[in-house]
């Protein structure tokens, strides 16, 4: 069914209408929209009370509502694909007519967590309880109903219509009937405020057709923000009643003349307006002309007023209403500025944090600070970022350049640094010599020593060598030399100073080198490609490193 019974309450600059009828939220919104409104907002406790009043009026008239709980659509909806947001007062819902989110909410229970379906909000009325201002209708969210299938829809809806202003109800000084027709097509004979552009039809008399007089008025804007009917004096006055009927229709005082005529007057501090009925305060602020949180400030001699806004807001073009100031226009922040109602907040870019001199300043985050460094070794903080470095003998590694990897000085394009054998270690290297040769004091060259078939002179003890932290490479590592059939290195005669390489084996006894002092009885063999007997020192280079070990008896040992 369509929307049937209706009730209306007008207050401030808005009218609320309540309707019964099983419509979907979309149909209800369409109904409100056809008459120039929207499903009602409930943006404050005061507005909730206005809506409650119009619902109470509807329920007094509506006998058909037999359900104990009744629901009425309001204009709070969440579109398909928009998720419930528990961090917000409106939980991700928004008002159909637009406008900013407000802190007021009155949810009935925890909301269903969903994103896919469009969700709509209704006011939940417990009809078994009296409607009290202290017990405002709760908000209930759910599916939005289906057009054309009343079974899936709720009992009714509330519309809201906003206006430039309102006229006071017409005052009758004698018997008669006023019928107001609003721009949203509602007729009523009792409105506490009548919206701009409404028509008033006044039928004077006590019902006798002969004595009935009719008057027609329109609520007009007489001056900016001043609305009236353009009538003067009380309507339907009757000498028979004088001031005794409805105070002569006067707003405050009624003064009778001896001939049954009467005049309206005002109490001290008030003045009579042009309609000769209504009294207005001599203090122009008493009518609360300022809106949106603006404060009314009296001008000199109490003649006029100006509206003043709270900090973070400014007057709009009407000079009556406050609108948010976008403080971010003035670039008050060092980096990012986020405008908020009545203020703003500063935010910092990634790599920065709030701090430093001045409001809204950002200071560099020291990623290298104790306990938070992402680098394996050296960390240098930079403005908004950082970079990692490695100690001598290591190079940066890893996808993000935070790890350090050992440089193998014994291989590479420049060739090894050592004259003869080269042993890579963590972050460094050491030289050694072939049997019959000894390491010169410079630690690089080899000189002919006493003839010996013992092991080659090896590197010093491990504990004498510096090792870098944070490396992800195994310790002191070299590869095993090429082996002959009996497990000994292949040997072929060479002339001059031999060069150890996979294709140029040397003539000597099995190559053995002393293991570090911590591992007695274990020999280490240098990698064939890591050991050279070259004619002088050469440049170090990076490379791989792996280890083979050999026992005293010539058998393979375990690493």
């Amino acid at each position: 069914t369509g929307a049937d019974t209706e009730a209306v309450v007008c207050v401030g600059t808005a009218c609320y209408t309540a309707h019964s009828g099983k419509l979907s939220a979309a149909e209800a919104q369409n109904h409100c929209n056809q008459n120039g409104g929207n499903l009602a907002t409930v943006k404050s406790k005061e507005e909730a009370q206005h809506v409650q009043r119009v619902l109470a009026q509807l329920l007094r008239r509506e006998a058909a509502l037999t359900a104990r709980m009744s629901k009425f659509w309001i204009g709070l909806q969440r579109e398909k694909g928009k998720c419930l947001d528990p961090s917000l007062p409106l939980k991700g819902f928004s008002w159909v007519g637009g406008g900013e989110d407000t802190p007021y909410s009155n949810w009935h229970k925890e909301l269903r967590n969903s994103c896919i379906s469009k969700r709509c909000v209704s006011l939940l009325l417990d009809l078994s309880q009296p409607l009290l201002p202290s017990r405002l209708p709760k908000w209930s969210e759910g599916p939005c109903g289906s057009p054309g299938s009343p079974g899936s829809n709720i009992e009714g809806f509330v519309c809201k219509f906003s206006f430039k202003g309102m006229c006071r109800p017409l005052a009758l000084g004698g018997p008669g009937q006023v019928t107001y027709t609003t721009p949203f097509q509602t007729t009523s004979s009792s409105l506490e405020a009548v919206p701009f552009a409404s028509a008033a039809n006044v039928a004077c008399g006590e019902g006798d057709k002969d004595e009935t007089q009719s008057h027609y008025f329109l609520c007009k804007e007489k001056a900016p923000d001043v609305f009236d009917w353009g009538s003067s004096g009380p309507l339907c006055v009757s000498p028979k009643y004088g001031c005794n009927f409805n105070n002569g229709g006067c707003h405050q005082d009624c003064f009778e003349g001896g001939d049954g005529s009467f005049l309206c007057g005002c109490r001290p501090g008030f003045r009579l307006l042009d309609d000769l009925v209504t009294c207005a305060s001599r203090n122009p602020c008493s009518s609360s002309p300022c809106r949106g949180g603006a404060t009314c400030v009296l001008g000199p001699h109490g003649k006029n007023y100006t509206c003043r806004c709270p900090q973070g807001y400014q007057l709009d073009s009407s000079q009556l209403d406050c609108v948010d100031v976008d403080e971010c226009q003035d670039s008050p922040c060092a980096q990012e500025c986020v405008n908020t109602p009545g203020g703003f907040r500063c935010e910092c870019w990634v790599g920065y944090e709030p701090g430093g001199p001045g409001e809204g300043a950002c200071q560099d985050v020291d990623e290298c600070a104790l306990g938070r460094s992402p680098c394996a070794q050296g960390c240098t903080n930079t403005d908004g970022s950082f970079h990692c470095s490695c100690e001598e003998g290591y190079v940066l590694a890893g996808e993000d350049g935070t790890q350090c990897q050992d440089v193998d000085e014994c291989v590479g394009p420049g060739g090894p640094l050592c004259d003869s054998l080269c042993f890579n270690t963590q972050g460094s290297f050491h030289c050694g010599c072939l049997p019959g040769w000894v390491l010169a004091p410079n630690g690089v060259s080899c000189t002919m020593g006493p003839v010996s078939l013992g092991p080659p002179s090896g590197p010093p003890d491990e504990e004498d060598k510096g090792e870098k932290e944070g490396s992800t490479v195994p310790r002191a590592a070299t590869a095993s030399p090429t082996r002959g059939p009996e497990g000994t290195p292949k040997a072929t005669p060479t002339t001059s100073r031999p060069s150890l390489s996979s294709d140029a084996p040397i003539t000597s006894a099995p190559l053995k080198m002393l293991a570090p002092s911590g591992s007695p009885g274990v020999w280490r063999e240098p990698s064939i490609h890591h050991a050279t007997a070259a004619s002088g020192p050469q440049e170090p280079a990076g490379g791989d490193s792996s280890v083979a070990t050999q026992n005293n008896d010539g058998t393979d040992g375990q690493k």
């Epitope: 694909g81 998720c83 947001d85 269903r112 967590n113 994103c115 379906s117 469009k118």
Partner: antibody, heavy 120, light 108 residues
Framework: QVQLVQSGAEMVKPGASVKISCKAS????????MHWVRQTPVYGLEWIGG????????AYNQNFKGRVTMTRDTSISTAYMELSRLTSDDTAVYYC?????????????WGQGTLVTVSS | EIVLTQSPSSLSASVGDRVTITCRAS???????LHWYQQKPGKAPKLLIY???NLAFGVPSRFSGSGSGTSYTFTISSLQPEDIATYYC?????????FGSGTKLEIK
């Protein structure tokens, strides 16, 4: 506790359709949306779409529009995902998933997965 | 649709290492709608971190997340052997939901 149990592996021919089920237990079926995600070696994890069991409303990834249909049977707390006009590219593990009491589409509960192989 | 690019695509680290994975979005994503998952071979993904930095129920505190806008980071403060898995970021800012391409984490 929340459990999502999916139907078994399927071997289907190109051009055919497949319908996978996901039976929910441990909560009120209509309280949580049910979503479907598939995983292939080439495309990784792909969201196919979701259904609101309370209303039957659906949301589909445009890449699957016209080929995917999601339904539910609230009486047996089961959601279904049907994919038609299959090609070898649809060979994947298909998961049903929902976000339980968490917000913002953080998928907290997952089915065990259903392997669908499209081969002639 | 919003494309999420994860880096690195794979990484090898040692037990006890600090591991960081980055997820970059092709356009801004609300931090509430950015989540991280762990997937082990043959298993369904498991939610680790929701809304950028909140640990899912039962997830160890060595996992953490941060970021905003288009840049998000997932960190394991001290890598454990059981953390070997592929890690995915996921976002929602209007349909479709999208996932990152994944970061495969291995132990050295």
């Amino acid at each position: 506790q929340v459990q999502l149990v999916q139907s078994g592996a399927e071997m289907v021919k190109p051009g055919a359709s497949v319908k996978i089920s996901c039976k929910a237990s441990g909560y009120t079926f209509t309280d949580y949306e049910m979503h479907w995600v598939r995983q292939t070696p080439v495309y990784g994890l792909e969201w196919i779409g979701g259904i609101d069991p309370e209303t039957g409303d659906t949301a589909y990834n445009q890449n699957f529009k016209g080929r995917v249909t999601m339904t539910r049977d609230t009486s047996i707390s089961t959601a279904y995902m049907e994919l038609s006009r299959l090609t070898s590219d649809d060979t994947a593990v298909y998961y049903c998933t929902n976000y339980g009491n968490l917000y913002y589409y953080a998928m907290d509960y997952w089915g065990q997965g259903t392997l669908v192989t499209v081969s002639s | 649709e919003i494309v999420l690019t994860q880096s690195p695509s794979s990484l090898s680290a040692s037990v006890g290492d600090r591991v960081t994975i980055t997820c970059r979005a092709s356009s801004s994503v609300s931090s509430s709608y950015l989540h991280w998952y762990q997937q082990k071979p043959g298993k369904a993904p498991k939610l680790l971190i929701y809304s950028t930095s909140n640990l899912a129920f039962g997830v160890p505190s060595r996992f953490s997340g941060s970021g905003s806008g288009t840049s998000y980071t997932f960190t394991i403060s001290s890598l454990q052997p059981e953390d070997i898995a592929t890690y995915y970021c996921q976002q929602y800012s209007g349909y479709p939901l999208t996932f990152g391409s994944g970061t495969k984490l291995e132990i050295k």
